[in-house]
Interface confidence: low
Amino acid sequence: GQFRVIGPGHPIRALVGDEAELPCRISPGKNATGMEVGWYRSPFSRVVHLYRNGKDQDAEQAPEYRGRTELLKESIGEGKVALRIQNVRFSDEGGYTCFFRDHSYQEEAAVELKVEDPFYWINPGVLA
């Protein structure tokens, strides 16, 4: 059946070196365990993470994300997932495309990641 893919609707913020979680879900919610779920980096669509046939497809992942991503699928039975990016870098900032594919149906949504410098938030008065 048909569905829509829905992102968070606002930018996700993370500090350099921290983890970021980019949520994505299908509506109406249904079991997505058997679906293909993926994340592309927009606009050049390098593969950030790909989940197919019940397994993460590490070989298809862009080198700069290898070993740094995890698909959080505790709620995949309800059609909800999130991409966790570890050790966030400034170069991770930008647009991501999340997609769900169910046999002959595929839809996408967008998620924006904002990366911030942790040192920017130090109160200068503390350093005096």
Partner: nanobody, 117 residues
Framework: QVQLVESGGGLVQTGGSLRLSCAAS??????MGWFRQAPGNQRELVAI???????NYADSVKGRFTISGDNVKNTVTLQMNSLNPEDTAVYYC?????????????WGQGTQVTVSS
């Protein structure tokens, strides 16, 4: 605003081939692909391609159809071989991508593909 220009539909006999092309103006795509809708049926995915080169196909067309794209020229082409009457439908090009800082989806007007037996 993204304009999609489709070409290449027509009438072909069973076992024949056709080539569909779709050109997008205005923005770089995230994915571009082809969907089809036969009378009385829902619109369904035929083949879709990310600008990074990853391609997905409907099971019914695997091994017969090939999608290729050029993310510099913003075009996507569907080569359809070994066509059969079940492939008869209106074929629609779909663009998704970032347009003026928002993620958008655009559909083409559709091109008729008819396979006669």
């Amino acid at each position: 605003q993204v304009q999609l220009v489709e070409s290449g539909g027509g009438l072909v006999q069973t076992g024949g081939s056709l080539r569909l092309s779709c050109a997008a103006s205005g923005s770089m795509f995230s994915t571009m692909g082809w969907f089809r809708q036969a009378p009385g049926n829902q619109r369904e995915l035929v083949a879709i391609m990310s600008s990074g080169g990853t391609a997905n196909y409907a099971d019914s067309v695997k091994g017969r159809f090939t999608i290729s794209g050029d993310n510099v020229k913003n075009t996507v082409t569907l080569q359809m071989n070994s066509l059969n009457p079940e492939d008869t439908a209106v074929y629609y090009c779909r663009f998704t991508g970032w347009v003026k800082s928002s993620f958008s989806t655009y559909w083409g007007q559709g091109t008729q593909v008819t396979v006669s037996s």
